[in-house]
């Protein structure tokens, strides 16, 4: 009896082993697709510009490295921001480095006051983990410094040097970002 | 090509009220965050007071916090500013537009000057 137990676990074990490898080929997957699409955005614009010599960002974009960033000059909750974001071709703000969110940090300094501004960054209801926008979890230097005591979705925003949790329904200002174009030779 | 009017402007006195109406031409706004903004004379156009599509939900500037109530009714397409409690410094010409990063052309606002 003892013995069919413990083959019983164990198979229960290997099912739960490769459950957990399919939901990581899952996200995995969900990361490359929306990797892939920022890939194709950017193709897509860098065609385009070929077209026409354009700048590597439009007006009123900051330009840094590879990226684009546009901090918004109005208030949205999270989810409207994110909207916002898409119908310029861009996605709320995806923070892959020290040197990025420094050169953030520096740029709102002189842009605006001490400000809120949404990024792509939310908490997962189930899990309680953060995640970008692509489904990627953020490095741990970049998690938001405090955990909001809201019982609604929580999502992360940038203020001063901080990166900062609130609830997602707040209105705060936001920042977009997206693939600089590559000049035409 | 869409046209927002601003109406419901004029002079008054310090401590009284106004209401402020915006509608558009050609387009419903229904399905757009809405809000208002404000520009006295030689200073910046500023933000005051955002509602979203659905009107459950609406934020506001510190200055006028407490003072204005934005609303909207989308039966009658129209997104209202309710000024109560006004100072001299909110004399200006406020305009209303949809609330997304690109805005429709402004229209000619609505001038509310308060006296003290």
């Known amino acids: 009896k003892l013995l069919q137990v413990s083959t019983i676990a164990m198979q229960q074990q290997e099912k739960l082993i490769q459950q957990e490898r399919a939901l990581l080929n899952f996200t995995e997957w969900k990361r490359s697709c929306a990797l892939q699409m920022k890939y194709c955005q950017a193709f897509m614009q860098n065609s385009l510009s070929s077209a026409h010599n354009s700048s590597p960002c439009p007006n009123n974009w900051i330009q840094n490295r590879e990226s684009c960033y546009y901090v918004s000059e109005i208030w949205s909750i999270w989810h409207t921001s994110q909207e916002n974001c898409l119908k310029e071709g861009s996605t709320l703000l995806q923070i892959e480095s020290k040197e990025e969110m420094d050169f953030i940090t520096g740029s709102l300094r002189k842009i605006k006051g001490s400000y809120d501004y949404w990024v792509g960054l939310s908490q997962d209801g189930h899990s309680g983990r953060w995640l970008w926008q692509d489904g990627s979890s953020p490095s741990p230097g970049l998690l938001p410094a405090e955990r909001s005591q809201s019982a609604n979705q929580v999502c992360g925003y940038v203020k001063s040097n901080s990166l900062l949790s609130s609830n997602c329904s707040t209105w705060k200002y936001f920042i977009c970002e997206k693939y600089a174009l590559r000049s035409s030779v | 090509q869409v046209q927002l009017v601003e109406s419901g402007g004029g002079l008054v006195q310090a401590g009284d009220s106004l209401r402020l109406s915006c509608t558009a031409s050609?387009?419903?706004?229904?399905?757009?965050?809405m809000a208002w903004w404000r520009q006295a004379p030689g200073k910046e156009r500023e933000y005051v007071a955002v509602?979203?599509?659905?009107?459950?939900?609406?934020h506001y500037s510190d200055f006028v916090k407490g003072r204005f109530t934005i609303s909207r009714d989308n039966a009658k397409n129209t997104v209202s500013l309710q000024m109560d409690s006004l100072k001299p410094e909110d004399t200006a010409s406020y305009y209303c537009n949809v609330n997304a990063i690109r805005q429709w052309p402004w229209g000619q606002g609505t001038q509310v000057t308060v006296s003290s």
């Open positions: 050609e387009r419903n706004l229904r399905s757009y965050d």
């Open positions: 509602i979203t599509s659905s009107g459950d939900s609406t």
